[in-house]
């Protein structure tokens, strides 16, 4: 159940997809990836206020218990709900291969 | 790929399963759940230092970019990797029903 998409903290402050430009060096991939030299990394960033994009019942529980025990129970966290696949040209023992990764780039986000 | 399970921050400080005792009132369920009166809620709590229980490639990317841009990119977050089902006796218009929920209790945890 995806709950409310209205962010009470103001536009862009709540859990959503962001794009961060990163080089192979930034990612620590320079020794095993040849291409791309730069990646537009999509990731989930932002606050998860009460019931905002709650992924499931567990997220709703977490919200309730965080309100009661903020020092013990953390608020729900903004994480990928699904991913977009991506290919990398990577070095192998004998040369290069084109490899698909299904869990690299966030496609959309929710709170859990 | 589940990466290292050794916590560099000390025993019990990193992402792991915790149990939090909660009443129906705590959970905001008192008006629609009859039983149980109290739930042993299992949830994922703790820090996600570099490569600790990294859920996938995305988590590894997040770790690298958090190290580079800590103000922009948050560290990976401790969330459920899977769930244990739970039944609730809940009120209905005509009486009660026994309902199974698959996404209520965390079974194990990873960082993402």
């Amino acid at each position: 159940a995806r709950n409310g998409d209205h962010c009470p903290l103001g536009p862009g402050r709540c859990c959503r997809l962001h794009t961060v430009r990163a080089s192979l060096e930034d990612l620590g991939w320079a020794d095993w990836v040849l291409s791309p030299r730069e990646v537009q990394v999509t990731m989930c960033i932002g606050a998860c206020p009460s019931q905002f994009r709650a992924a499931n019942m567990h997220a709703q529980i977490k919200t309730s218990l965080h309100r009661l025990k903020p020092d013990t129970v953390p608020a729900p966290c903004c994480v990928p709900a699904s991913y977009n696949p991506m290919v990398l040209i990577q070095k192998t023992d004998t040369g290069v291969s084109l490899q698909t990764y299904d869990d690299l780039l966030a496609k959309d986000c929710h709170c859990i | 790929a589940r990466n290292g399970d050794h916590c560099p921050l000390g025993p019990g400080r990193c992402c792991r399963l915790h149990t939090v005792r909660a009443s129906l009132e705590d959970l905001g369920w008192a008006d629609w759940v009859l039983s149980p009166r109290e739930v042993q809620v299992t949830m994922c709590i703790g820090a996600c230092p570099s490569q600790f229980r990294a859920a996938n490639m995305h988590a590894q990317i997040k770790t690298s970019l958090h190290r580079l841009k800590p103000d922009t990119v948050p560290a990976p977050c401790c969330v459920p990797a899977s769930y244990n089902p739970m039944v609730l006796i809940q009120k209905t218009d005509t009486g009660v029903s026994l309902q199974t929920y698959d996404d209520l209790l965390a079974k194990d945890c990873h960082c993402i």
Epitope: L34, S35, P36, P85 | -
Partner: antibody, heavy 118, light 107 residues
Framework: QVTLQESGPGLVKPSETLSLTCSFS??????????VGWIRQPPGKGLEWLAH???????YFNTALKSRLTISKDTSKNQVSLKLSSVTAADTATYYC??????????WGQGTSVTVSS | DIVMTQSPATLSTSPGERVTISCKAS??????VAWYQQKPGQSPRFLIY???YRYTGVPDRFSGSGSGTDFTFTISSVQSEDFAVYYC?????????FGGGTKVEIK
């Protein structure tokens, strides 16, 4: 496994528009880094790159042919189309489509032969 | 556009011999040169990426080297199935361009 199949009219009259379709399987054009390119080869001659289209809909064209070329994709149908307008006998060739991963063209179709003649 | 010039146009050799093909770019393309093999009636087969990296499944008798403007493709010991046309291609910048091809034929 990855396969690509070109289809076209076989015979086109001068000044008309040549329409080609590349139908593929084994990969998705919604995957970051993936593209489909078109290359042609006149009879007994070498290879000439024509155009390519990327997962994000960015398009690139052969400089000399740019004004005559159109490329488009239908991600849900796993198809890429190429149109070449105002054809002449010089456009007679075997037309290939190829799967691209960044700057690698690793899988090619078998090609479709196109003759421009009245 | 970057012009790729291959030499020789034709090369006659015998099985077991070493074969070397040259490719020159009209401007610096770093190491961004690929090599393809094409047999009669077939589509091109991708062999070498970025001057020297063999693609998955390509036998190690095929190799490439070079950077800047001068590139070399080598077959260390030609097999009967290697008689074909070989093309270099720059992937440094679009428009991508191919060399004119080198036909490796049986002497």
């Amino acid at each position: 496994q990855v396969t690509l199949q070109e289809s076209g009219p076989g015979l086109v009259k001068p000044s008309e528009t040549l329409s080609l379709t590349c139908s593929f399987s084994g990969f998705s054009l919604s995957t970051y880094g993936i593209g489909v390119g078109w290359i042609r080869q006149p009879p007994g001659k070498g290879l000439e790159w024509l155009a390519h289209i990327w997962w994000n809909n960015n398009k690139y064209f052969n400089t000399a042919l740019k004004s005559r070329l159109t490329i488009s994709k239908d991600t849900s149908k796993n198809q890429v189309s190429l149109k070449l307008s105002s054809v002449t006998a010089a456009d007679t060739a075997t037309y290939y489509c190829a799967r691209m991963g960044y700057d690698i063209m690793d899988y090619w179709g078998q090609g479709t032969s196109v003759t421009v003649s009245s | 556009d970057i012009v790729m010039t291959q030499s020789p146009a034709t090369l006659s050799t015998s099985p077991g011999e070493r074969v070397t093909i040259s490719c020159k770019a009209s401007q610096d393309v770093n190491t961004a040169v690929a090599w393809y093999q094409q047999k009669p009636g077939q589509s091109p087969r991708f062999l070498i990426y970025s001057s020297s990296y063999r693609y998955t499944g390509v036998p190690d008798r095929f190799s490439g080297s070079g950077s800047g403007t001068d590139f070399t493709f080598t077959i260390s010991s030609v097999q009967s199935e290697d008689f074909a046309v070989y093309y270099c291609q720059q992937h440094y910048s679009t428009p991508w361009t191919f060399g004119g091809g080198t036909k490796v034929e049986i002497k």
